[in-house]
Amino acid sequence: QRINTEKETLPKPIIWAKPSIMVTNGNSVNIWCQGAQSASEYQLYFEGSFFALERPKPSRSMNKVRFFISQMTSHTAGIYTCFYQSGELWSKSSNPLKLVVTGLYDTPNLWVYPRPEVTLGENVTFFCQLKTATSKFFLLKERGSNHIQNKYGNIQAEFPMGPVTRAHRGTYRCFGSYNDYAWSFPSEPVTLLITGGVENSSLAPTDPTSSLDYWEFDLSTNESGLQKDSAFWDHTTQN
């Protein structure tokens, strides 16, 4: 149900983070907000509260600004939105941008059962273990799949992959999370190799040149099937 009286607003801006929405504790991150050419002011909000203000530089592109977070910590991890003003009007909110801080406290162990090299169609399960008690575990595949899976668990979580296809091959890491925005150090990478069967070019392997410190993903959960939530994790890669 929508309320009858609606405020007149401008179209929503686009928000994204560079180099990534996952930032190692202590590292810097840029949050970009792109609105209209006529925008006179941009405001960044963190978890519903005003966080920072930027005015576009006349010498540069007028329709976007950069907000700089010099040191990412658990206190700056969370959801950011931005707004812009043009004349007397304010824009609608951007989509939420979730910034996660990694590199906290401990490093989990990741292993794969029955082994890292399996035949096509074999059942595979990843296990992630963290000695520090945590609430949730995340399994990420570098590049390629654009999926995160999460599982609740205290010290260990298992991620059943089912009968594997060539799409499953690639390099995986896991994290333990202390809350949705504060994650552990990443585990050592585990590369899953699939042998046998007929090569299918539509299921391309993971890009071997992918950078290990840059993650590109959508949020997925495998508690009741895989449900993509791409809008929430969209960090619109633009220059």
Partner: nanobody, 123 residues
Framework: DVQLQESGGGLVQAGGSLRLSCAAS????????MGWFRQAPGKEREFVAA????????FYTDSVKGRFTISRDNAKNLVYLRMNSLTVEDTALYYC????????????????WGQGTQVTVSS
């Protein structure tokens, strides 16, 4: 279709407590700030409390600070309003709202609204 359904209202004596719940469906719950508003007969709908996406920040109108507590469970798509030390002035229809407001207290900046649950405080 987005639906917000409030529950937990009722008749309570002054000084008593209630807990309101709001269940959201058809929306990615964690992508929205959730708010509670209220409307007494013959009065404007007014802001009561709001909670940020990840429950990092909470916001209250002055008259309920220290008495009301807003919380949310993103895993269950629920938002709650715990109301203690209720007074006759708290009698109203309580609405749950979802949005991405710049000013959390502005009812015009919330996109979705429930039908409301009645809270009546007797002296």
């Amino acid at each position: 279709d987005v639906q917000l359904q409030e529950s937990g209202g009722g008749l309570v004596q002054a000084g008593g407590s209630l807990r309101l719940s709001c269940a959201a469906s058809g929306v990615t719950f964690s992508q929205y700030i959730m708010g509670w508003f209220r409307q007494a007969p013959g009065k404007e709908r007014e802001f009561v409390a709001a909670i940020s996406y990840g429950a990092v920040n909470t916001f209250y109108t002055d008259s309920v600070k220290g008495r009301f507590t807003i919380s949310r469970d993103n895993a269950k798509n629920l938002v709650y309003l715990r109301m203690n030390s209720l007074t006759v002035e708290d009698t109203a229809l309580y609405y749950c709202a979802a949005g991405r407001p710049r000013q959390v207290s502005s009812k015009l900046e919330y996109d979705y609204w429930g039908q409301g649950t009645q809270v009546t405080v007797s002296s």
